[in-house]
């Protein structure tokens, strides 16, 4: 084969957002017949030669960035995309509200606001069923997530988290769920 071996995939099951003391499994998946897998925790000098890492109880020290590669013969693959493993429940939950309210007409606008008593500068908003968050690039304590021209696809259950940019993998507990209802569709 010419060029480097293709990169494997790295995933966290059931999720990369892991409440403290709950289990999670990191799984590196390459092609069949791999000689050796290497799973690394970045910025810690740690590695292990296994495709699967089972964490029976999530700890603060295990939060961070992970990456994996594999070796066939003397050749190493390209590294996987980095996986960000986040410990949640490290801090008290923020509150999530909708302005002007949780019921909004199709085509209207709504702003979801995540509020915390602590001096966190980062917020993440998740919609149930979506793997990726709506991340807020702004840094303020009263985090606003405007949703312009609402459609039926925006209806659902939302939760937000707060955290500090100094410790980006240690998050609060999730807010209580907020049900966004889109009417007139």
């Amino acid at each position: 084969q010419s060029g480097p071996l293709p990169k494997p995939s790295l995933q966290a099951l059931p999720s990369s957002l892991v409440p403290l003391e709950k289990p999670v499994t990191l799984r590196c998946q390459g092609p069949p017949g791999v000689d050796l897998y290497r799973l690394e925790k970045l910025s810690s000098s740690r590695y292990q030669d296994q495709a699967v890492l089972f964490i029976p109880a999530m700890k603060r020290s295990l939060a961070g960035r992970y990456r994996c590669s594999y070796q066939n013969g003397s050749l190493w693959s390209l590294p996987s995309d980095q996986l960000e493993l986040v410990a949640t429940g490290v801090f008290a939950k923020p509150s999530l509200s909708a302005q002007p309210g949780p019921a909004v007409s199709s085509g209207g606008d709504v702003t979801l606001q995540c509020q915390t008593r602590y001096g966190f500068d980062q917020f993440a908003l998740y919609k149930e069923g979506d793997p990726a968050p709506y991340k807020n690039p702004e840094r303020w304590y009263r985090a606003s997530f405007p949703i312009i021209t609402v459609t039926a696809a925006h209806s659902g259950t939302y939760r937000c988290y707060s955290f500090s940019s100094r410790d980006p993998y240690l998050w609060s507990a999730p807010s209580d769920p907020l049900e966004l209802v889109v009417t007139g569709t």
């Epitope: 050796l36 290497r38 690394e40 925790k41 970045l42 910025s43 810690s44 000098s45 740690r46 590695y47 292990q48 030669d49 960035r65 990456r67 590669s69 070796q71 190493w76 590294p79």
Partner: antibody
């Protein structure tokens, strides 16, 4: 306490072979990655080869690939380096070094080193 | 030619502070790998001095400290003493072929 003692160095002609040994004591040898690291006279450190605890995971520096073979015998707490097709530029003190380990994790640094054994390749 | 770049030599008077730099690239230090430092006294084997960028093994005086930023790292020695005269090596890991890499070494001379 942890001890690593290298042996087997000596004078060898270019193209010749030599087998280095490293006797380990004071720790559970089979749980640890170990490496060979060399230092040419008056020069810096160069990593040569590493081997995982079970012996199945091995890695080599490009400069020795195909000529050197690392192996271990966990029953004898010993690490080996078989060096073939030796060249003048392989002349160096060869150290064996243990990689730090904690729980199930290995680490990318060396916490204990042997005193080294000198290999001289010259006609 | 070493993968990590260090100055060949540094010097300082007793009691002074000196720093030794270690510059890598996006495939080693910049790829999320830590930097570790070793001290090699004349005629002896290297000894681990700093691990994980800034951590000291037990027995290493707090006059020695390390830091990392981006693709480079540095070792600082304060209150320089005659017994600090040695060669210092930085070490990291390289993502390309998963090999361990060293700097070329820096000879520290304590003046006077």
């Amino acid at each position: 306490q942890v001890q690593l003692v290298e042996s087997g160095g000596g004078l060898v002609k270019p193209g010749g072979s030599l087998r280095l040994s490293c006797a380990a004591s004071g720790f559970s040898f089979g749980d640890y990655y170990v490496s060979w690291i060399r230092q040419a006279p008056g020069k810096g450190l160069e990593w040569v080869s590493a081997i995982g605890g079970s012996g199945s995971a091995v890695q080599y520096a490009e400069s020795v690939k195909g000529r050197f073979t690392i192996s271990r015998d966990n029953a004898k707490n010993s690490l080996y380096l078989q060096m073939n097709s030796l060249r003048a530029e392989d002349t160096a003190v060869y150290y064996c070094a243990r990689h730090y380990r904690e729980f199930r994790w290995h680490y990318y640094y060396f916490d204990y080193w042997g005193q080294g054994t000198l290999v001289t390749v010259s006609s | 030619q070493s993968v990590l770049t260090q100055p060949p030599s540094v010097s300082g008077a007793p009691g002074q502070r000196v720093t030794i730099s270690c510059t890598g690239s996006s495939s080693n230090i910049g790829a999320g790998y830590d930097v570790h430092w070793y001290q090699q006294l004349p005629g002896t084997a290297p000894k681990l001095l700093i691990y994980g960028n800034s951590n000291r093994p037990s027995g290493v005086p707090d006059r020695f400290s390390g830091s990392k930023s981006g693709t480079s790292a540095s070792l600082a020695i304060t209150g320089l003493q005659a017994e600090d005269e040695a060669d210092y090596y930085c070490q990291s890991h390289d993502l390309g072929a998963h090999v361990w890499v060293f700097g070329g070494g820096t000879k520290l001379t304590v003046l006077g």
